[in-house]
Amino acid sequence: AVNGTSQFTCFYNSRANISCVWSQDGALQDTSCQVHAWPDRRRWNQTCELLPVSQASWACNLILGAPDSQKLTTVDIVTLRVLCREGVRWRVMAIQDFKPFENLRLMAPISLQVVHVETHRCNISWEISQASHYFERHLEFEARTLSPGHTWEEAPLLTLKQKQEWICLETLTPDTQYEFQVRVKPLQGEFTTWSPWSQPLAFRTKPAALGKDT
């Protein structure tokens, strides 16, 4: 028996991956469990094995096809089940009808690079990964810059309310090491959430020219 709450949460990356987490507070799962996906209008079923990510949560990825293939649409519904082995049979632990485009979480942006750097400014670009063409331009971004002596949590968030895959950081300090991260979110979906943060991009501003203010 479970004393606390349990939760089964899944997100679609908009192309060919559904990532799921099954958690049970106060439960020790000593049996094998899996997630099973049964779409309403596709000929495939898919299963992944839940693997521990912490003491009380397990995760897996339903790989639906090649990374950039469009495996689901806005009208698809996928019935998702958590199944755990109980003796010789599988027992359903959780179930839901999953609307992929209501539960989106994209992959973290990739290919971050410094386009141009000056003493007080830096222009950075990035790319989105495995994002559906259905979104067209309906995406937004959040970015943050890590300054010396601060933590990521302290960094103010910069919001880009459009599909803009670059940013010009201003009012930087000359000859200073910074790090930069960005994340993306579609505008669509009641339960849609931000992507993970990108890998940090480290850069250094140029030193100020001696005897001259730039």
Partner: nanobody
């Protein structure tokens, strides 16, 4: 949020059948998994079964599997629990419940946010 109301309970003889209804009002019914739990006198509330938002998926407690069947009519905001081959151990108060919108249904009553008042089912031998 969603409000839930059970009906259809009563007295039935062992081996008989009964159909319970769970009527919902409030938020969009088709966003919610609906589950049934029951509580016998002096016992803890136990999971009976759950049905997904569209009705495509169901699962049941092993004690009722093959005897109880869940169905739903989203246009009428109602879930039905058809109970066949009833026995005295099925006696109790039957509650329908829902987790938060978009959440999965589980066997754990702690995961459910919305509850009806319950309807009494008594199976006599």
């Amino acid at each position: 949020q969603v409000q839930l109301q059970e009906s259809g309970g009563g007295l039935v003889q062992a081996g008989g059948s009964m159909r319970l209804s769970c009527a919902a009002s409030g938020r969009t019914f088709s966003n919610y998994v609906i589950a049934w739990f029951r509580q016998a006198p002096g016992k803890e509330r136990e999971f009976v079964g759950a049905i997904t938002q569209t009705g495509r998926g169901t699962f049941y407690a092993s004690s009722v599997e093959g005897r109880f069947t869940l169905s739903r009519l989203n246009d009428q905001s109602t879930v039905y629990l058809q109970m066949n081959s009833l026995n005295p151990e099925d006696t109790g108060v039957y509650y329908c419940s829902a987790p938060r919108s978009g959440r999965a249904g589980t066997r754990n009553q702690m995961d459910y946010e919305y509850w009806g008042q319950g309807t009494q089912v008594t199976v006599s031998s």
